[in-house]
C-alpha cells in the first residue's frame, strides 16, 4: 500500500510531492546564510542562530518549535594567554614557537571571534621534555613502540599525526603510555591529496591549517559533570576531578609547517617501516629526543585553556502525527561549528532546513504524517555530542517508549564521489528501496538510479549487486539514540573515493578554511550532491513517519548476526588451546542466532499476511518492529562503558568513529595473549558470550507471536 493511505490525504501528497519540493538552490542559500560568521558552541552568535532557526521553522509551518537549554562543561582558549609549543635550548630560551592562529582565508580577514586552533578540554600545563613520534597514536602504534622497539614514552611529549582514529583515542593511548603531553598534527600524507591545490585555490590543507577538535573519552556520557542525567537548572554537578572523560595531560594541535620544524630534528630510532612515514621531508625518526647537534634542545608546551560551565541551546521542532502522534521519527543534526562550518555541520544543517521547509509546505496544504516527526538542531556536538545527549537524557523515558527511528544529519558531504550510508540492519531494505527510486547525481550515470551508481562505486564486500552499508560507530549525534537507548538509527552523506584518496576525512576538516566558498567552488557548485543527500535523509524520514507498516526488515538483522558471530568465533579460534583449556564454547551464541533467524523469518511471513485494517494488530506488529532495536540493549551496559548498552554494536574501544560488532566479546578477546591472568581473561570471554547469546535469544523472542 502507498504511504499516503496512512492519513487519507489527496494522492499528490505522497513521497514524490515531498521530494519534488526539495530544491538545490534553497540548500545553497541556507548554507550561505549559516556560514558567514563562526557559530562556536556557547557563544552569543550560536544562540542567535538558534533563535533564527526557531523562527524560520515556525514560518515553515511546524506545529511547535522550542529551545531546550542546558548548562554543560565547555572548553575555550585563554584570549590573553595563547596556547603554543616551543623548542627550547639548554638555557631555556624559546628558539622556535608554533603559530598562534591560522592565516584567515580571503574575504574573512576582518571576521572576529575566530577561535584559534586548540584541543578542547586539554588541561593547562607547561610540560617540557624529549619528543617521541608515535605515528597515528593507535593502539597498534604503541604496541610497536613499546613491545617491539622497546621505546618508553613515560615522561615524554609525544607527537602524533591526525587520521585513522578519533583524536580522543590517541590522547587516551598516550596517557596510558605515560606521556606528559601530546602534539597532534596534520601530515600531508593524510590531508593533502596529490594533484590538488591548497585552499583558496583548491580543497587541500595549507601548511598553516590546523584541525581543531575535542579530545574527550566520554564513552557516551554527555556533559562530563552530569553523566546519565540532564544538565538542567537543578543538576548536581561532579567536581572537575570526578568529571567523565577529561584528558589528564596537555594536548595541542598544529599544522604541517610547524610540524616540519619539530620533526626535522628528531633522532633516536628510525621509523620501524614505511607505514610510519608521512609526506614531509623529514626522517620520521621515532626518537626519543632530537638528533646529535640538537640533542640538548627540548620541546615545551604552553597550554592555558579553561573549562567553563556554559549554556547551550538545542532547537526542537515538532510536526505532530495524525494517526500515531505518540510515535516519534527524529531528524537531527548539529548547528555548532568550530569556525565557519562550511561542511561540518552547515552542509547538513542547510539540508535539514530544506527538509523542514518541504514538510512544512505539505502541512500547509493539509497533509500530516502518520507519526510525529521531531526535528532537532543540536548544540555543542563538537564538544562531545553534548546537546543531543543532554536532550535525550532529559527525554529518555519518552524516547525509549515512543522512539521509532533517528536519522542523523551532520555534514552532507565529505567528498563528491558516491553515497555513504551507515545504519541499523533494520533500515537496509528501506535504504535500498529508496535509492532505487532516486536519480543519481553522478556524472556518467544520467538517467540511472542512485542505487545503481552507489552500487557500482561502493559495492558490498559480501553481496554482489548491492551497495556497501557500514556499521554505526560514534562521533556524531546518533550515539545516544542508538548506543544508549536502542532506537533504530541511520546516517547518509556523499563521500570521497576511499580507494584513491587515502587522506583521513576531508583535508580542511575543522579548520578555518571550511567555508561556504570551499563547498560552492570545489565540492558541489550545483548543490546536486546536497540535494541528493536531502532526498535520502528526507525520504527515509518520510517513509519512517508515514508508511503504514514500519519499513524495517528484521531478516536483515538475522543475516548480520550470523556474519558477526562467525567473525568473533574466528577471532577466538586464533587461541584453540585456550578454548579447550578453559572450555570456551560459542554454541549458545550460534544457537541464539539460529533461533533469531527462524523467528524473524516467521515474523516476516506474518507481516505480509496480517489484517492491516485492524488498528490494534497493526500497532502490535509495528511495536514489535519498533522495539526490536531496543531488545538489543543491556541495561547494565558494556564493561567500564555504562552508556554503551547495545550488545550488537558499540564504538570501537580503539577508535570512537568505528563500529564494532559483539563489542563485549571483541574487547574481552582483544590482545588476550598479553593478559597476565589467562584464567580471568578467558572467564570474561565466556561471560561475554553468555551475555551476547542471552541478548540475541531475548531479542528473538520479542518477535515471536505474542500469544
Amino acid at each position: 500500500k502507498s504511504s499516503n493511505e496512512a492519513t487519507n490525504i489527496t494522492p499528490k501528497h505522497n513521497m514524490k510531492a515531498f521530494l519534488d519540493e526539495l530544491k538545490a538552490e534553497n540548500i545553497k542559500k541556507f548554507l550561505y546564510n549559516f556560514t558567514q560568521i563562526p557559530h562556536l558552541a556557547g557563544t552569543e552568535q550560536n544562540f542567535q542562530l538558534a533563535k533564527q532557526i526557531q523562527s524560520q521553522w515556525k514560518e515553515f509551518g511546524l506545529d511547535s518549535v522550542e529551545l531546550a537549554h542546558y548548562d554543560v562543561l565547555l572548553s575555550y582558549p585563554n584570549k590573553t594567554h595563547p596556547n603554543y609549543i616551543s623548542i627550547i635550548n639548554e638555557d631555556g630560551n624559546e628558539i622556535f614557537n608554533t603559530s598562534l592562529f591560522e592565516p584567515p582565508p580571503p574575504g574573512y580577514e576582518n571576521v572576529s571571534d575566530i577561535v584559534p586552533p586548540f584541543s578542547a578540554f586539554s588541561p593547562q600545563g607547561m610540560p617540557e621534555g624529549d619528543l617521541v613520534y608515535v605515528n597515528y597514536a593507535r593502539t597498534e602504534d604503541f604496541f610497536k613502540l613499546e613491545r617491539d622497539m622497546k621505546i618508553n614514552c613515560s615522561g615524554k611529549i609525544v607527537i602524533a599525526r591526525y587520521g585513522k582514529v578519533f583524536r580522543g583515542n590517541k590522547v587516551k593511548n598516550a596517557q596510558l603510555a605515560g606521556a606528559k603531553g601530546v602534539i597532534l598534527y596534520s601530515d600531508p600524507a593524510d590531508y593533502f591529496a596529490p594533484g590538488v591545490k591548497s585552499y583558496p585555490d583548491g580543497w587541500n590543507l595549507p601548511g598553516g591549517g590546523v584541525q581543531r577538535g575535542n579530545i574527550l573519552n566520554l564513552n557516551g556520557a554527555g556533559d562530563p559533570l552530569t553523566p546519565g542525567y540532564p544538565a538542567n537548572e537543578y543538576a548536581y554537578r561532579r567536581g572537575i576531578a570526578e568529571a567523565v572523560g577529561l584528558p589528564s595531560i596537555p594536548v595541542h594541535p598544529i599544522g604541517y609547517y610547524d610540524a616540519q620544524k619539530l620533526l626535522e630534528k628528531m633522532g633516536g630510532s628510525a621509523p620501524p617501516d614505511s607505514s610510519w612515514r608521512g609526506s614531509l621531508k623529514v626522517p620520521y625518526n621515532v626518537g626519543p629526543g632530537f638528533t646529535g647537534n640538537f640533542s640538548t634542545q627540548k620541546v615545551k608546551m604552553h597550554i592555558h585553556s579553561t573549562n567553563e560551565v556554559t549554556r547551550i541551546y538545542n532547537v526542537i521542532g515538532t510536526l505532530r502525527g495524525a494517526v500515531e502522534p505518540d510515535r516519534y521519527v527524529i531528524l537531527g543534526g548539529h548547528r555548532d561549528s568550530w569556525v565557519f562550518g562550511g561542511i561540518d555541520p552547515q552542509s547538513g544543517a542547510a539540508v535539514v532546513h530544506e527538509i523542514v521547509r518541504s514538510f512544512g509546505t505539505l502541512k500547509k496544504e493539509g497533509w500530516r504524517p502518520r507519526r510525529t516527526i521531531l526535528f532537532a538542531s543540536w548544540d555543542a556536538e563538537e564538544f562531545g555530542l553534548l546537546g543531543s545527549t543532554e536532550w535525550a537524557e532529559e527525554n529518555s523515558r519518552l524516547l525509549q517508549e515512543r522512539g521509532v527511528a533517528y536519522i542523523n544529519a551532520d555534514s552532507s558531504i565529505e567528498g563528491n564521489y558516491t553515497l555513504r550510508v551507515d545504519c541499523t540492519p533494520l533500515m537496509y531494505s528501506l535504504v535500498h528501496n529508496l535509492t532505487k527510486e532516486l536519480k543519481s547525481p553522478d556524472e556518467g550515470f544520467e538517467g540511472k538510479s542512485l542505487y545503481e551508481s552507489w552500487t557500482k562505486k561502493s559495492p558490498s564486500p559480501e553481496f554482489s549487486g548491492m551497495p556497501r552499508i557500514s556499521k554505526l560507530g560514534s562521533g556524531n549525534d546518533f550515539e545516544v539514540f542508538f548506543q544508549r537507548l536502542g532506537i533504530a538509527s541511520g546516517r547518509a552523506r556523499y563521500t570521497k573515493n576511499w580507494e584513491t584518496n587515502k587522506f583521513s576525512g576531508y583535508p580542511l576538516y575543522h579548520s578555518v578554511y571550511e567555508t561556504y566558498e570551499l563547498v560552492e567552488k570545489f565540492y558541489d557548485p550545483m548543490f546536486k550532491y546536497h540535494l541528493t543527500v536531502a532526498q535520502v535523509r528526507g525520504g527515509m524520514v518520510f517513509e519512517l513517519a508515514n508508511s503504514i507498516v514500519l519499513p524495517f526488515d528484521c531478516r536483515d538483522y538475522a543475516v548480520v548476526l550470523r556474519k558477526y558471530a562467525d567473525k568473533i568465533y574466528s577471532i577466538s579460534m586464533k587461541h584453540p588451546q585456550e578454548m579447550k583449556t578453559y572450555s570456551v564454547s560459542f554454541d549458545s551464541l550460534f544457537s541464539a542466532v539460529k533461533n533469531f533467524t527462524e523467528i524473524a523469518s516467521k515474523f516476516s511471513e506474518r507481516l505480509q499476511d496480517f489484517d492491516k485494517s485492524n488498528p490494534i494488530v497493526l500497532r502490535m506488529m509495528n511495536d514489535q518492529l519498533m522495539f526490536l532495536e531496543r531488545a538489543f540493549i543491556d541495561p547494565l551496559g558494556l564493561p567500564d562503558r555504562p552508556f554503551y548498552r547495545h550488545v550488537i554494536y558499540a564504538p570501537s574501544s580503539h577508535n570512537k568513529y568505528a563500529g564494532e560488532s559483539f563489542p563485549g566479546i571483541y574487547d574481552a578477546l582483544f590482545d588476550i595473549e598479553s593478559k597476565v591472568d589467562p584464567s580471568k581473561a578467558w572467564g570474561e570471554v565466556k561471560r561475554q558470550i553468555y551475555v551476547a547469546a542471552f541478548t540475541v535469544q531475548a531479542a528473538a523472542e520479542t518477535l515471536s507471536e505474542v500469544a
Partner: antibody, heavy 117, light 108 residues
C-alpha cells in the same frame, strides 16, 4: 590444563654442551613469548633468555651471550636452549616458562644441569 | 639494568601472624612489579602482578602495594602453606627481566 615439561638436563664437564627441550600444552604456543629462567642450588632466580612468538627476536642475560642459543619450533610446541661452553657457574635448575609482557605466568617443573669435572 | 633489592632476606613468623616483605627497585618501574612464591623443590608460582593485582585462585590474604621504586607484599593471617620463599620481579624495563634475591619465610 597448562603444562610445560623440560628435558635434557644432566651432568656435563666444563666447556661441554647440552641441549634443553621443553614441550608445552594447554595454550596456543605460537601466541606467546617463551623464556628460560634458572636457579642455582640454594640461590635466587635468574632470567636467562627469551624468544618472540615467531622466533624473530631473542634476548639473553649478559653472562650467557655468545654461549647459549634459544630457539623454538611452533609446529612441535617446543622450546629449546642450546648451551655451549658450559661453566661451573651455569649449574642450576633450568625452568622453561611462558612469558607474558615480561611476567612469568607458567613454569615447568625444571631440569637440573650440573657442570662439573 | 634495573636492580631489585628485597628485605628482609629471611623472617620467622607464626600461623595467624601478618607479615610484610618489601622490594625496592634501583629506578622507577611505575607499577610493573610481580611477586612469586616458591616452595622447596618446586617451581615458582605467580601471586601478584602489576604491584597489586591478585592472580585468579590466589587467596585474598595476599596483597601487594606500591609504585615507583618501593613495593610491599603483605600476607594477612599466615596459613601453614604460606611458609615459602618469595621473590619480586620487575617487568618494566626488559630485557633483562630481573628478580629480587628472595625472602625466606619460616615458621617461628
Amino acid at each position: 590444563e597448562v603444562q610445560l615439561v623440560e628435558s635434557g638436563g644432566g651432568l656435563v664437564q666444563p666447556g661441554g654442551s647440552l641441549r634443553l627441550s621443553c614441550v608445552v600444552s594447554g595454550f596456543t604456543f605460537n601466541n606467546y613469548w617463551m623464556s628460560w629462567v634458572r636457579q642455582a642450588p640454594g640461590k635466587g632466580l635468574e632470567w636467562v633468555a627469551n624468544i618472540k612468538k615467531d622466533g624473530s627476536e631473542k634476548y639473553y642475560v649478559d653472562s650467557v651471550k655468545g654461549r647459549f642459543t634459544i630457539s623454538r619450533d611452533n609446529a612441535k610446541n617446543s622450546l629449546y636452549l642450546q648451551m655451549n661452553s658450559l661453566r661451573a657457574e651455569d649449574t642450576a635448575v633450568y625452568y622453561c616458562a611462558r612469558d607474558i609482557m615480561a611476567t612469568i605466568i607458567d613454569w615447568g617443573q625444571g631440569t637440573l644441569v650440573t657442570v662439573s669435572s | 639494568d634495573i636492580q631489585m633489592t628485597q628485605s628482609p632476606s629471611s623472617l620467622s613468623a607464626s600461623v595467624g601472624d601478618s607479615v610484610t616483605i618489601t622490594c625496592r627497585a634501583s629506578q622507577s618501574i611505575n607499577n610493573y612489579l610481580n611477586w612469586y612464591q616458591q616452595k622447596p623443590g618446586k617451581a615458582p608460582k605467580l601471586l601478584i602482578y602489576t604491584a597489586s593485582s591478585l592472580l585468579s585462585g590466589v587467596p585474598s590474604r595476599f596483597s601487594g602495594s606500591g609504585s615507583g621504586t618501593d613495593f610491599t607484599l603483605t600476607i594477612s593471617g599466615l596459613h601453614p602453606e604460606d611458609f615459602a620463599t618469595y621473590f619480586c620481579q620487575q617487568s618494566f624495563s626488559t630485557p633483562p627481566i630481573t628478580f629480587g634475591q628472595g625472602t625466606r619465610l619460616d615458621i617461628k
